[in-house]
């Protein structure tokens, strides 16, 4: 049953003497495993014998024996998928049909599968694109319709005979829907490729020739173009002629329309292979150019710049920069139009000309006030000297000059006084529009320039203005010298050094920290009483009733300053100690006695000690010893001892009675 | 070396009185350099000091504010001791009670071994 | 009479230095010189440290110091050792008919 069999390989396989050929194919044997396998050679069919006659390339049989002579054809299948096959080498006789006969347990078929051997390799098949245009990227195509393992080819680009720079990729194919080798070259072709050979030449593995296809490239491109121009360098003067002439080196397709360029910009009705200027003015100097359009678009020539050449116009002059600041520097620039450029300039500073300047530019590194004016310039060249034209104001800005602080006052100015003080200067630009005083203050500013300062203080030693427009100018501060009374006074205690104590010998200074004018007279007191008219008051051995408080008086012609009151405080041993007793000195058994040690001590008592008529050191350490309950055998005389960081201080015995309550007396 | 041995019931009734004695050997309780002081210690009041009794040229006493009313010490010249008397207890009289010594400083260098009374 | 104020627990590594404090008022703390700190292990009667602020009774260890600074006083402990983990008080004489105060108490636990 035929529709048992089916059979996947290329129709038709190209090779060529020597070469090889190699047969992809494919097929399904529904019923089972192919049993017998003959390759014929232009089979037959015999209707008698009901078999294929013709030449047998190579046949299996079940018993798997391949007869020696067919090592040149290889079935390289198998019993169910695979019905590949190779002849290496492949002879020209090899031509023809050939025809696969399969054998089943119970089917049978013939598959037949052309060969085309030819006597020299054939050629390869270039393949372009419909149209080429200049810098755009085509792909060359090189197809051959072979490939064999067994007969290693390759493909190769020339363009003009000379091998192409640029890479190719070969690919093969050896399927079953096709066998073939390709190559394909991308490329951008310049105009100039136009007309050119491209080949693609067949090689053996050794890059021996064996065959190759030809085409000639159409390179579709603009117009490229030649310019001429007389005269050749295209420098005239005023009023001569220029002509110029547009020359097609290669065009395709044909030209179609042409015109010129100057500047970018078409001239009007000059649509001719040549452009004739005549009587030129500076005003058609500038690039021309022809451009010539075609299918693909417009093509244009090199420019050709036309210079037209006059004497200098009228010029100006350009300042970096105006208002210039005093000290800046400033460049000035001298513009003409000309042609050929200036070779020399001229130039005029408040019309009077600047001598030793002839650039273009005249350079100031520090502007002073003076620079300020009018500057102008003449430029010159090879046809003439141009005019002199209005010319450029400097403006030279600067700080207020000679600024100073003048005081209105009468002198001397006491502390307190109003003090009235004005700025001056001698010249400014731009004006002064503002003025500034240090040190700072809460002062009132009546008029521009004026400062009034109201109860000036004694420490307002100088003042400074300034004069300000765009900056501040200031002025040396002047000296107010103030005057004033005495000031900072205060007691200081010159020895002893540390803590007074009584008997010492003690100096007490009058301090001041300063006084305008200097000469002062002293005045010291305690409680208001005059104690001295020296700058120190002394004590040859102080005590504790010297304590106290204390003044001094600076004073000069302005008035007199008192210091604070100072405490005087004298340290000495407790002293007029007594014991008090609480609540009295005759206390009845029982009951509570208080023993008080009173002292007068500077610092007070750190520390109490309690003794008994006997002597004997009680253990109390406070000013108060409490008795509770007191026994009359606690009768007797007690003392106490008071100690501070001076000394020590001792009462006088006092006596303590306890008498008996009514109850022990009743009880006797 | 000064030693304090303390002596005295560990339990006595609400409202009877806590009566212990503290003996003195090293030292005299006559002395005129030292002083004799009862001290006790509860959880709930910490270490609280009693009162003292010491010899001068007579004896003295000192005793604390809380106890004032109830407390008397006395020294007892024929046995070298000194004991310590609390009236009327109640449970919040319950502590370890400590004899010491002060010497001629504010301080205590030597105490007895305690005693604990539970009231 | 209050007792004087001392931190419940202070504590230390061993080699550490602890201080505690003990704050009074000018009645006491602040008014003497007359400040004691004493030891007590569980169980036993307190032991004499430091008297009159910063002196030493002989047979204590220099690594016990006393200070005052106004109405506080203060015991460090520098060199901590495990012998050293105990209850310890404060006392100040008192110018109030308590002669004698006491502080409150400081647990000193070596870590």
């Known amino acids: 049953d035929s529709s048992k069999w089916v059979f996947e390989h290329p129709e038709t396989l190209y090779a060529w003497e020597g070469a090889c050929v190699w047969i992809p194919c494919t097929y399904r044997a529904l019923d089972g495993d192919l049993e017998s396998f003959i390759l014929f050679h232009n089979p037959e069919y015999n209707k008698n014998t009901s078999k294929f006659d013709g030449t047998r390339l190579y046949e299996s049989t079940k018993d798997g024996k391949v007869p020696s002579e067919q090592k040149r054809v290889q079935f390289l299948g198998d019993k169910n998928k695979n019905c590949t096959l190779s002849i290496h080498p492949v002879h020209l006789n090899d031509s023809g049909q050939l025809g696969l006969r399969m054998e089943s347990k119970t089917e049978k078929w013939m598959e037949r599968i052309h060969l085309n051997v030819s006597e020299r390799p054939f050629p390869p098949h270039i393949q372009l694109p419909p149209e080429i245009q200049e810098s755009q990227e085509v792909t060359l195509t090189c197809l051959l319709n072979f490939s064999c393992y067994g007969y290693p080819i390759q493909l190769q680009w020339l363009l003009e005979g000379v091998p192409m720079r640029q890479a190719a990729v070969t690919s093969t194919s050896l399927t079953i829907k096709s066998v073939f080798t390709r190559s394909e070259l991308k490329f951008s072709p310049q105009w100039s490729h136009h007309g050119k050979i491209v080949t693609c030449q067949l090689q053996d593995a050794d890059g021996k020739f064996l065959s190759n296809d030809t085409v000639q490239l159409n390179v579709k491109h603009t117009p490229k173009l030649e310019i001429k121009v007389t005269p050749s360098d295209a420098i005239v003067r005023e009023g001569d002629s220029v002509t110029m002439t547009c020359e097609v080196s290669s065009s395709n397709p044909e030209y179609t329309t042409v015109s010129w360029l100057k500047d970018g910009t078409s001239l009007k009705k000059q649509n001719t292979f040549t452009l004739n200027l005549r009587e030129v003015t500076k005003d058609q100097s500038g690039k021309y150019c022809c451009q010539v359009s075609n299918d693909v678009g417009p093509g244009r020539s090199e420019e050709v710049f036309l210079q037209v050449q006059y004497a200098p116009e009228p010029s100006t002059v350009q300042i970096l920069h105006s208002p210039a600041v005093e000290g800046s520097q400033v460049e000035f620039l001298c513009m003409s139009l000309a042609n050929p450029l200036p070779t020399n300039y001229t130039w005029y500073h408040n019309g009077k000309e600047m001598q030793g300047r002839t650039e273009e530019k005249v350079h100031i590194p520090k502007i002073l006030p003076w620079h300020a004016g009018t500057y102008s310039c003449v430029a010159e060249n090879i046809l003439g000297t141009g005019q002199r034209g209005p010319g450029a104001e400097l403006d030279v800005q600067y700080p207020p000059k000679k600024v100073t602080t003048v005081i209105q006052n009468p002198m001397p100015i006491r502390e307190g006084d109003t003090v009235t003080l004005s700025c001056n200067y001698n010249s400014s630009n731009p004006s002064v529009t503002r003025y500034e005083w240090k040190p700072h203050g809460a002062w009132e500013e009546p008029s521009l320039g004026v400062l009034k300062i109201q109860n000036v203080g004694w420490d307002n030693t100088t003042i400074a203005c300034a004069a300000c427009n765009s900056w501040c100018s200031w002025a040396s501060p002047v000296a107010l010298n103030v005057q004033y009374a005495p000031r900072d006074v205060r007691v200081r205690k010159i020895k002893p050094l540390s803590e007074i104590h009584s008997g010492n010998s003690v100096s007490l200074q009058c301090d001041f920290s300063s006084s305008h004018p200097k000469e002062v007279q002293f005045f010291w007191e305690k409680n208001g009483r005059l104690l001295g008219k020296e700058s120190q008051l002394n004590f040859d051995s102080i005590s504790p009733e010297d304590a106290g408080s204390y003044s001094c008086w600076v004073n000069n012609s302005i008035g007199q300053t008192a210091s604070k009151a100072w405490t005087l405080e004298v340290l000495y041993a407790p002293r007029r100690l007594r014991v008090s007793m609480s609540p009295g000195d005759q206390v009845m058994e029982g009951k509570s006695a208080t023993l008080t040690c009173e002292s007068d001590a500077n610092p007070p008592v750190s520390h109490y000690t309690w003794f008994d008529w006997n002597n004997q050191s009680l253990p109390y350490h406070s000013q108060k010893l409490r008795l509770e309950p007191v026994k009359v055998q606690h009768s007797g005389a007690y003392w106490c001892q008071g100690t501070n960081s001076v000394g020590k201080g001792r009462s006088p015995l006092s006596t303590l009675t306890v008498y008996y309550s009514p109850e022990t007396i009743g009880r006797r | 070396e000064v030693q304090l041995q303390q002596s005295g019931p560990g339990l006595v009734k609400p409202s009877l009185t806590l009566s212990l004695t503290c003996a003195i050997s090293g030292d005299s309780v006559s002395s005129n350099s030292a002083t004799w002081t009862w001290i006790r210690q509860s959880p709930s009041r910490g270490l609280e000091w009693l009162g003292r009794t010491y010899y001068r040229s007579t004896w003295y006493n000192d005793y604390a504010v809380s106890v004032k009313s109830r407390i008397t010490i006395n020294p007892d010249t024929s046995k070298n001791q000194f004991s310590l008397q609390l009236n009327s207890v109640t449970p919040e009289d319950t502590a370890v009670y400590y004899c010491?010594?002060?010497?001629?400083?504010?301080?205590?260098?030597?105490w007895g071994q305690g005693t604990l009374v539970t009231v | 009479q209050s007792a004087l104020t001392q931190p419940a627990s202070v504590s230390g590594s061993p080699g550490q230095s602890i201080t505690i404090s003990c704050t009074g008022t000018s009645s006491d703390v602040g008014g003497y010189n007359y400040v004691s700190w004493y030891q007590q292990h569980p169980g036993k009667a307190p032991k004499l440290m430091i008297y009159?602020?910063?002196n030493r009774p002989s047979g204590v260890s220099n690594r016990f110091s006393g200070s005052k600074s106004g109405n506080t006083a203060s015991l460090t402990i520098s060199g901590l050792q495990a012998e050293d983990e105990a209850d310890y008080y404060c006392s100040s004489y008192t110018s109030s008919s308590t002669l004698y105060v006491f502080g409150t108490g400081t647990k000193v636990t070596v870590l």
């Open positions: 010491a010594r002060e010497g001629s400083g504010s301080y205590y260098a030597y």
């Open positions: 009159d602020v910063s």
